[in-house]
């Protein structure tokens, strides 16, 4: 019992989740490309989800996609339209903690 407590204590000590940089608001022009960056780090490596206006982001082939990066995750929107306006939020979790950041796309 004592040793298992020590192991879990060590795991807790090594476990972390940090928002390294708040997401910026993005202003761009119709037809252009916008990129939103979710800069987080953690152990275990965090799972990152993207939301737009309170709902999970819908990926659109060749237009809207997100992918993991060395710093967290990047969401890219090509051929921007007025309908893309809104609040974009990334939510990262390492299984124990949760951090999030929100930016507005105009």
């Amino acid at each position: 019992p004592t040793s298992s407590w020590n192991i879990s204590s060590e795991l807790n000590k090594d476990s972390y989740l940090t928002l390294d940089e708040p997401m910026n608001n993005i202003t761009t022009s119709l037809g252009q490309t916008a990129e939103l960056h979710c800069k987080v780090s953690g152990n275990p490596p965090p799972t990152i989800r993207w939301f737009k206006n309170d709902a999970p982001v819908v990926q659109e082939p060749r237009r809207l996609s997100f992918r993991s990066t060395i710093y967290g995750s990047r969401l890219r929107i090509r051929n921007l339209d007025t309908t893309d306006t809104g609040y974009f939020q990334c939510v990262a979790t390492n299984g124990k903690e949760v951090v999030s950041s929100t930016g507005v796309l105009f």
Epitope: N53, D54, A55, P56, V58, T82, D84, T85, V104, F106
Partner: antibody, heavy 120, light 107 residues
Framework: EVQLVESGGGLVQPGGSLRLSCAAS????????IHWVRQAPGKGLEWVAA????????YYADSVKGRFTISADTSKNTAYLQMNSLRAEDTAVYYC?????????????WGQGTLVTVSS | DIQMTQSPSSLSASVGDRVTITCRAS??????VAWYQQKPGKAPKLLIY???SLYSGVPSRFSGSRSGTDFTLTISSLQPEDFATYYC?????????FGQGTKVEIK
């Protein structure tokens, strides 16, 4: 308590102008989009225009583009809808509304509405 | 443009009835659908957001659900104060699109 109070409605002739006001209180005005939504007598809800007061980004329905102008004064916590070249089909109750903070669109607070009648 | 097709346009029901209103989006809007209630001469009131989240202060007899691009508002046991017009709205693509409305009348 969040409050939105519209004013400025009334009877106006076709081709005339009117300016609606939406006075906001109880929340950080510059942190939210403000929308105008209208409802013609006996009809459904129609989005008209929106603005983000902190950035002055503006958006319009095609039906009002070029005729209506939305603006905001953050020092007065008030949004405006300047309506020019009014037509009979603009007759409606006009509501200003505020969305939830995490949404640009879903409207959780509405004003009481102000009636605009366009008639000769 | 995104279309929100709401049905039925009107229905008659009695107090205590279970009432279901549906809305179909013309393309995926994720879970970003809201439902509003409007009574004559009054502003709309938010009931449900994110397809199934009950807005603060709204009675638990109201619920929402999603199946793909189909969204449903259910009133489990209709009360006298529930006779009104209900609108769906997609909240994913700015500036949002409203359904045509469903008027719930007394049978």
């Amino acid at each position: 308590e969040v409050q939105l109070v519209e004013s400025g409605g009334g009877l106006v002739q076709p081709g005339g102008s009117l300016r609606l006001s939406c006075a906001a209180s109880g929340f950080t005005f510059s942190s939210y989009f403000i929308h105008w939504v209208r409802q013609a007598p006996g009809k459904g809800l129609e989005w008209v225009a929106a603005i983000h007061p902190a950035f002055s980004f503006t958006y319009y329905a095609d039906s009002v583009k070029g005729r209506f102008t939305i603006s905001a004064d953050t020092s007065k916590n008030t949004a405006y809808l300047q309506m020019n070249s009014l037509r009979a089909e603009d007759t409606a109750v006009y509501y200003c509304a505020r969305p939830r903070l995490s949404s640009a669109v879903v409207l959780d607070y509405w004003g009481q509405g102000t009636l605009v009648t366009v008639s000769s | 443009d995104i279309q929100m097709t709401q049905s039925p346009s009107s229905l008659s029901a009695s107090v205590g009835d279970r009432v279901t209103i549906t809305c179909r989006a013309s393309q995926s809007v994720s879970s970003a659908v809201a439902w509003y209630q409007q009574k004559p001469g009054k502003a709309p009131k938010l009931l449900i957001y994110s397809a199934s989240s009950l807005y603060s202060g709204v009675p638990s007899r109201f619920s929402g659900s999603r199946s793909g691009t189909d969204f449903t508002l259910t009133i489990s046991s209709l009360q006298p104060e529930d006779f009104a017009t209900y609108y769906c709205q997609q909240g994913y693509y700015f500036p949002g699109t409203f359904g045509q409305g469903t008027k719930v009348e007394i049978k």
